[in-house]
């Protein structure tokens, strides 16, 4: 008999996610307007473009990025765009009340509905880790809990490390990886007998998995640009971040190749790899002076990619339960501390160039930055997975983990596949 | 030649809006912040509100937050000012002024400065009674 | 929003250097420029960034800064250098610009 929406979240789900829809809009109706200032049509268009990308990277990059199970393709993509939806009305929010609230209603621009896109991507960055072992009643908590965590601690990093829009949300890699980790740790581990092919590729879906990395390579400089404050540092993280994709894409290929025995190349190295510059240049795309930086730091980040997809599986699969085609958490968790390293070492070089105690203490105050995005990732992801493992939520079981039919209807499919 | 103009001054009374405007010339106005700086008479330079180039963003001073606003129309070269609920301390002369951002490099990063590089003669904005 | 704090009034004897500072915590953060403004006339810059002089600017004009201190130094001060010069800084992570209260430097 094909396997059906257990009856307690059927009706969990709706009446869970409906009321708070309904607060959503009761928060919207009393706290917020939009900005009716007067702009002329093109410039409207023109930033509307740069969110549009985020979009497309969200929706189709991310969403089709993490349907290369087998058994879980439709559930992937579909679950990340309800995130993405419900995330980014939460964020605009939250961000709202956290930086304009005190002065009255929170003004919606074209702005805020990119930052608040970027702070939803952190969660599908993050739930590549637990997709496939939690139902969608369990992932409003996590998109709820990890947009007011990263909503919070840009807040914070803001205040304290006095920085801005980019360098603030450059923080997502990090923080996005180590959330998904921690929640991955707390929920059940072991697969059970006879349902490990679940967590399998297959190739169409593994194709639809390259469609999704296609889309963030080619939108990537769009979200490595799209917070910074003027078009000569746009422009310069555009040109910086295309010229380190390109590069860890042939890193990626050749490097998946070197590492197979037979010199093969890994679906799954290639996946990730792809993507690979873009992170490593995020936190400094616009400090870059010159295209060979960018690209030593694409070959790099390339490199320690493929590395980290050849090793770190086995270690994420015993430790965390983490099957091994979800690259994205170990991934992003390596190439966005190196990201974050090599701005630190930037302004380690300015302290040795120009002894200025300023510049000395920016080096002090990013790694404060850099370890406080860690703690908070932490344990705002052990306190999310606690939370994940209350009954409340009844989670699927085990030997129900990847597997779109408990959550889909399949007309065709009489039996199970 | 690079060019601000401020108008729209005038006198007017305490409660009551006025629509300040800066007609930009010799540059690329959409490429460019723009700020709006005040100084009341016999005092110092007070930063009222910047706006980015592409309009996306705007702050006040925590002095005119609520009451002025900052907008742009880059299809006329235009810069505006509105400002409501005038008091008697907003009296001042209004200037506009261009962001410019520089920056220098070195061979491993670029340093980006954010400054006032042009500025109008300024407008002159009296709250009276 | 931060504060900066400058001296209220300096003089100097013309051919002599005068040094202006500029104190406060977001110069820790970020560079200060520095404009130079005579009676009834729009602001000038003069100095912005580590030591950068705007095209037109001498090169008597020469600016420093250490920890949460901004420093603009005239070497040679002529008459045309009397005027009232505020510093400058930007907040980064509010965006927001905060001027000094402004240093009067007479020329004598």
């Known amino acids: 008999m094909s396997s059906k929406y257990p009856r307690s979240v059927r009706r969990c789900l709706p009446l869970w996610a409906l009321t708070l829809e309904a607060a959503l809009i009761l928060l919207f109706y009393f706290f917020t307007h939009y900005d009716a200032s007067l702009e002329d049509q093109k410039g409207l268009v023109a930033s509307y473009q740069v969110g549009q990308d985020l979009t497309v990277m969200a929706a189709i990059g991310l969403g089709f990025l993490t349907s290369s199970f087998r058994r879980h393709s439709w559930s992937s993509v579909a679950f990340n765009l309800f995130m993405l939806a419900l995330g980014v009305q939460w964020a605009i929010l939250l961000d709202g009340f956290l930086s304009q609230f005190p002065s009255g209603k929170v003004v919606i621009t074209l702005f805020s509905i990119r930052l608040a896109t970027m702070s939803a991507l952190s969660v599908l960055i993050s739930v590549d880790a637990v997709l496939g072992k939690v139902n969608l009643a369990q992932l409003v908590v996590m998109v709820l809990v990890e947009v007011t965590a990263l909503g919070n601690l840009r807040m914070v990093i803001s205040n304290i490390f006095n920085t801005d829009y980019h360098m603030n949300m450059m923080h997502i890699y990090v923080f996005a990886a180590y959330f998904g980790l921690s929640v991955a740790w707390c929920l059940p581990k072991p697969l059970p007998e006879g349902t490990e092919d679940k967590d399998q590729t297959a190739t169409i879906p593994s194709l639809s998995a390259m469609l999704g990395a296609l889309f963030l390579w080619m939108f990537w400089p769009s979200f490595n640009s799209a917070l910074l404050r003027s078009p000569i540092e746009r422009k310069n993280a555009v040109f910086n971040t295309y010229y380190a994709v390109a590069v860890s894409v042939v890193t990626a290929i050749s490097g998946s190749s070197l590492a197979h025995p037979q010199g093969k190349i890994s679906k799954t190295y290639v996946h990730s790899a792809v993507l690979a510059g873009g992170v490593a240049v995020g936190t400094s795309c616009h400090l870059i002076p010159s295209p060979w930086l960018a690209m030593v730091l694409g070959l790099v980040a390339g490199l320690i990619s493929v590395g980290g997809a050849k090793y770190l599986p086995g270690c994420c699969n015993r430790v965390l339960g983490i099957p091994h085609s979800s690259i994205m958490g170990y991934n992003f968790s390596l190439l966005g501390l190196l990201g974050e390293i090599i701005y630190i070492v930037l302004l380690v070089l300015d302290t040795v160039g120009a002894g200025n105690g300023m510049i000395g203490f920016q080096v002090l105050l990013s790694i404060g930055e850099l370890s406080l995005a860690i703690v908070i990732a932490l344990m705002s992801g052990l306190l999310t997975g606690l939370l994940l493992n209350l009954k409340i939520w009844k989670a699927p079981h085990e030997a129900k983990y990847f597997d779109d039919q408990v959550f889909w209807k399949f007309p065709h499919l009489a039996v199970g596949f | 030649e690079v060019q601000l103009v401020e108008t729209g001054g005038g006198v007017v009374q305490p409660g009551r809006s006025l629509r300040l405007s800066c007609a930009a010339s010799?540059?690329?106005?959409?490429?460019?912040?723009m700020h709006w700086v005040r100084q009341a008479p016999g005092k110092g330079l007070e930063w009222v509100a910047v706006?980015?180039?592409?309009?996306?963003?705007?702050y006040y001073a925590d002095s005119v937050k609520g009451r002025f606003t900052i907008s742009r129309d880059n299809s006329k070269n235009t810069l505006y000012l509105q400002m409501n609920s005038l008091r008697a301390e907003d009296t001042a002369v209004y200037y506009c002024?261009?962001?410019?951002?520089?920056?220098?490099?070195?061979?491993?990063?670029?340093?980006?400065?954010?400054?006032?590089?042009?500025w109008g003669k300024g407008t002159t904005v009296t709250v009276s009674s | 929003s931060s504060e900066l704090t400058q001296d209220p009034a300096v003089s100097v004897t013309l051919g002599q250097t005068v040094r202006i500072t500029c104190q406060g915590d977001?110069?820790?953060?970020?560079?200060a420029s520095w404009y130079q403004q005579k009676p009834g006339q729009a602001p000038i810059l003069v100095i912005y960034?580590?030591?950068i002089r705007p095209s037109g600017i001498p090169d008597r004009f020469s600016g420093s800064t250490s920890g949460n201190t901004a420093s603009l130094t005239i070497t040679g001060a002529q008459a045309e250098d009397g005027g009232d010069y505020y510093c400058?800084?930007?907040?980064?992570?509010?965006?927001?610009?905060?001027f000094g209260d402004g240093t009067r430097v007479t020329v004598v």
């Open positions: 002024a261009r962001e410019m951002v520089s920056y220098s490099s070195s061979w491993y990063r670029r340093y980006y400065y954010y400054n006032m590089d042009v």
């Open positions: 010799g540059f690329t106005f959409s490429s460019y912040g």
């Open positions: 706006i980015w180039y592409d309009g996306s963003n705007k």
């Open positions: 977001s110069l820790r953060h970020s560079y």
């Open positions: 960034g580590k030591n």
């Open positions: 400058n800084s930007r907040d980064t992570s509010t965006d927001h610009y905060v």
